[in-house]
């Protein structure tokens, strides 16, 4: 999916609200320097592509992502302002439901989402100079 | 404006399945989630379950797992609720509930009139 | 899961009294994933209040909302007869999700 159409100031908004508040809470009790982000991007389409890919696709050691609350709650804003979005997540989807089992926050999946605070802090800067 | 139409009272037989219906109008139905939720005679409201229509992704209260099968159906913006081996415990009022965001934050923004399921032989 | 526990579950109040409803959370979750909902009889829940303070479109300024961490509330400044119903707390961060038992409160 080519994200240059999304209206970003919205999703950046649902970001703020809500969706740091439940990556935060998947968060607690770890350290903010325990994890190296090591993952990055260079605009809010690139960022919105990483986010997406981290969010919603399987990893080696961390399968159960897309059902945590901040997943939804980002499913729900790209599908609401990023158009045709939803249309083309049926197959992704398909191949989510086979590689998840259960929901266990693994230290692989806590790293995963440090990196994802991370992108998503990214795309709120989007005029940052890339380091 | 956005509605949700639900489907007509029930009366069903103990043992027996229902599938219940909301009808979407007024906003694109494919981009959000539908939840439903059930309220049994003079009790609160319990979340049953979400699916977003756009690939039928669901997510389960675990107490309503194979009870409550969620569905949609994108081509004419209607989810289902199907409720199966029914017993008295199942007698309530089912509502479905859109997932939206109002002034960016996250909640059920906007209910059917709700579907009331009578169990009973 | 995430418990709410909300009290009175029961209240009455006269015209122009004010009136407190809480909402105690079992974990701590972040303030802009409590709602509130009212309901009158026979008909569907309606939002009513969002992310613990926004007022939902259409309600009243009478009606406030405040808390953080375990702790919310809703509060009515002057008691008016169309605000007798029954409200819900509902919890929007983590599955599954959550609502109070609501509080009833009548006209007195």
């Known amino acids: 999916y080519d994200f240059t159409n999304c209206d970003f100031e919205k999703i950046k908004a649902a970001y703020l609200s809500t969706i740091s508040k439940d990556l935060i809470t998947y968060m607690s009790g770890t350290k903010s320097t325990e994890f190296n982000n090591t993952v990055s991007c260079s605009n809010r389409p690139h960022c919105l592509t990483e986010i997406q890919s981290l969010t919603f696709n399987p990893t080696a050691g961390c399968a159960s992502l897309a059902k945590e609350m901040f997943a939804m709650k980002t499913k729900a804003a790209l599908a609401i302002w990023c158009p045709g979005y939803s249309e083309t997540q049926i197959n992704a989807t398909q191949a989510m439901k086979k590689a998840r089992k259960s929901k266990v926050t693994t230290n692989k999946c806590l790293e995963q989402v440090s990196q994802l605070q991370g992108l998503w802090r990214r795309f709120n800067r989007p005029l940052l100079k890339q380091q | 404006q956005v509605q949700l139409q639900q489907s007509g009272a029930e009366l069903v037989r103990p043992g027996s399945s229902v599938k219940i219906s909301c009808k979407a109008s007024?906003?694109?139905?494919?981009?959000?989630?539908m939840n439903w939720v059930k309220q049994r005679p003079g009790q609160g409201l319990e979340w049953i379950g979400q699916?977003?229509?756009?690939?039928?992704?669901?997510n389960y209260n675990g107490k309503f797992k194979g009870k409550a099968t969620l569905t949609a159906d994108k081509s004419s913006s209607t989810a289902y609720m199907q409720l199966s081996s029914l017993t008295s415990e199942d007698s309530a009022v089912y509502f479905c509930a859109r997932g939206g965001y109002v002034n960016f934050l996250y909640a059920m923004d906007y209910w059917g009139q709700g579907t009331s399921v009578t169990v009973s032989s | 899961e995430i418990v709410l526990t909300q009290s009175p579950a029961l209240m009455a109040a006269s015209p122009g009294e004010k009136v407190t409803i809480t909402c105690s959370v079992s974990?701590?979750?972040?303030?802009?994933?409590l709602h509130w909902y009212q309901q009158k009889s026979e008909t569907s829940p309606k939002p009513w209040i969002y992310?613990?303070?926004t007022l939902a479109s259409g309600v009243p300024v009478r009606f406030s909302g405040s808390g953080s961490g375990t702790s919310y509330s809703l509060t009515i400044s002057s008691m008016e007869a169309e605000d007798a119903a029954t409200y819900y707390c509902?919890?929007?961060?983590?599955?599954?999700?959550?609502f109070g038992a609501g509080t009833k409160l009548e006209l007195k």
């Open positions: 974990s701590s979750i972040s303030s802009s994933n």
């Open positions: 699916i977003f229509p756009g690939d039928g992704e669901t």
């Open positions: 007024g906003y694109a139905f494919s981009s959000y989630w």
């Open positions: 992310g613990t303070s």
């Open positions: 509902q919890q929007w961060s983590s599955y599954p999700l959550t």
